[in-house]
């Protein structure tokens, strides 16, 4: 039951996270004009990954897309790429995780297949979340650098009669949405990976205890498992259940080479 809950919660958290990453990517307020001493402004500028906007105090808002590709800063292109990669990985992860959900039955899908799919989607969510966090952080760093550069410019070269009002930009709402969404996707991915451990079938090689009976050696497996000669070499990839009534969730598993596809 706990594994199902962990998997379900991981899916929901990742879903919210990816929705947030998509929202952040589409938002126009990645950077907003710094109002410093003046909370009321006649002209308010803000910028997104795809367009820049101006809102006048009259209420009129005008947005212009960045119609050039080569003329854009490399950092902006990098942030765009990171966010898109995050969305694509997240979307694929969501698709995979839907089929991996324990509550959804698809034909006669093996538990091991569901475990592998859960792990795959979990890793995808983790990478997706990291991409979003990286993208937002790169943009934030770019803003901080530009902010202090423009601040320096504001206080230099003012010897002349004419002053130029330097527009400084600070963190926009999209950055916070992106950070939170990336974090949620990351958490969801970790939860999926944890759930995967509980989903995978029993594959542990149990150490056999030898009892020397008269005449020939027989190795007995503890806990009601079948006895076999040797030390479990033929039990690899076989489900050997004891008579106890155990739910699938309670069957503890450990990662094997087959879990990482």
């Amino acid at each position: 039951m706990a594994v199902t809950a962990c998997q379900g919660l991981g899916f929901v958290v990742s879903l919210i996270g990816i929705a947030g990453i998509i929202a952040a990517t589409c938002m126009d307020q990645w950077s907003t004009q710094d109002l410093y001493n003046n909370p009321v402004t006649a002209v308010f500028n803000y910028q997104g990954l795809w367009r820049s906007c101006v809102r006048e105090s009259s209420g009129f808002t005008e947005c212009r897309g960045y119609f050039t590709l080569l003329g854009l800063p490399a950092m902006l292109q990098a942030v765009r790429a990171l966010m898109i990669v995050g969305i694509v990985l997240g979307a694929i992860g969501l698709l995979v995780s839907i089929f991996a959900l324990k509550c959804i039955r698809i034909g006669s899908m093996e538990d091991s297949a569901k475990a592998n799919m859960t792990l795959t989607s979990g890793i995808m969510f983790i990478v997706s979340g990291l991409c979003a966090i990286a993208g937002v952080s790169v943009f934030a760093n770019m803003l901080v650098t530009n902010f202090w550069m423009s601040t320096a410019n504001m206080y230099t070269g003012m010897g002349g009669m004419v002053q130029t009002v330097q527009t400084r930009y600070t963190f926009g709402a999209a950055l916070f949405v992106g950070w939170v969404a990336g974090g949620l996707t990351l958490i969801g991915g970790v939860m999926m990976c944890i759930a995967c451990r509980g989903l995978a079938p029993e594959e542990t090689n149990y150490k056999a205890v030898s009892y020397h009976a008269s005449g020939h050696s027989v190795a007995y497996k503890p806990g009601g498992f079948k006895a076999s000669t040797g030390f479990g070499s033929n039990t690899k990839n076989k489900k050997i259940y004891d008579g106890g009534a155990r739910t699938e969730d309670e069957v503890q598993s450990y990662p094997s080479k087959h879990d990482y596809v």
């Epitope: 402004t41 006649a42 009259s58 009129f60």
Partner: antibody, heavy 118, light 113 residues
Framework: EVQLVQSGAEVKKPGASVKVSCKAS????????MHWVRQAPGQRLEWMGM????????NYNEKFKGRVTITRDTSASTAYMELSSLRSEDTAVYYC???????????WGQGTTVTVSS | DIVLTQSPDSLAVSLGERATISCKSS????????????LTWYQQKPGQPPKLLIY???TRESGVPDRFSGSGSGTDFTLTISSLQAEDVAVYYC?????????FGQGTKLEIK
Amino acid sequence: EVQLVQSGAEVKKPGASVKVSCKASGYTFTSYWMHWVRQAPGQRLEWMGMIHPNSGSTNYNEKFKGRVTITRDTSASTAYMELSSLRSEDTAVYYCARLKTGNSFDYWGQGTTVTVSS
Amino acid sequence: DIVLTQSPDSLAVSLGERATISCKSSQSLLNSGNQKNYLTWYQQKPGQPPKLLIYWASTRESGVPDRFSGSGSGTDFTLTISSLQAEDVAVYYCQNAYTYPFTFGQGTKLEIK
């Protein structure tokens, strides 16, 4: 047709207060910022402050802060400008004006003459 | 506050001639976000409130005759009346629409020569 109709001329003594009204019609009153601008004889136009009729949020020129209060009555589609502690230099024509695209004033009231004299 | 200085203070032009009024700003009125200049021109006739002519430095308000045109960028702006008509006799003001408090030029009185 958009119209801004202001209250009549006022004569006040120094230290007194004056409240000028501006009734809007022909448009959605709550959708546009209403500004107040004054013009003293032979002087340039001087921006005093503004109010958003929908939210009631205001912004004033520092020069008039503490002396000017802009309010509105949405049910009557009317904006008000009250100037206190009147001085002789406050003698001017007071205008209300609607803000439009480009942060420009497209419609103005006819003006209210306020005379401050002892 | 932004200071706007108009020149000349008064101007006399013959009917049908070109009239040019200048407006200089103490700060740039160009907004980098949309590359628009936040300068507005008004016409005021005696006993009347100002009338909007030009906004964004060069965009003519609807209903304004096309003989009125605005130009300039940054700190230097010009209002041009290509062919002066008798009804154009008035005082013309420029306005900073970029930052609060909004400020106005001292005005240019246009007369017929």
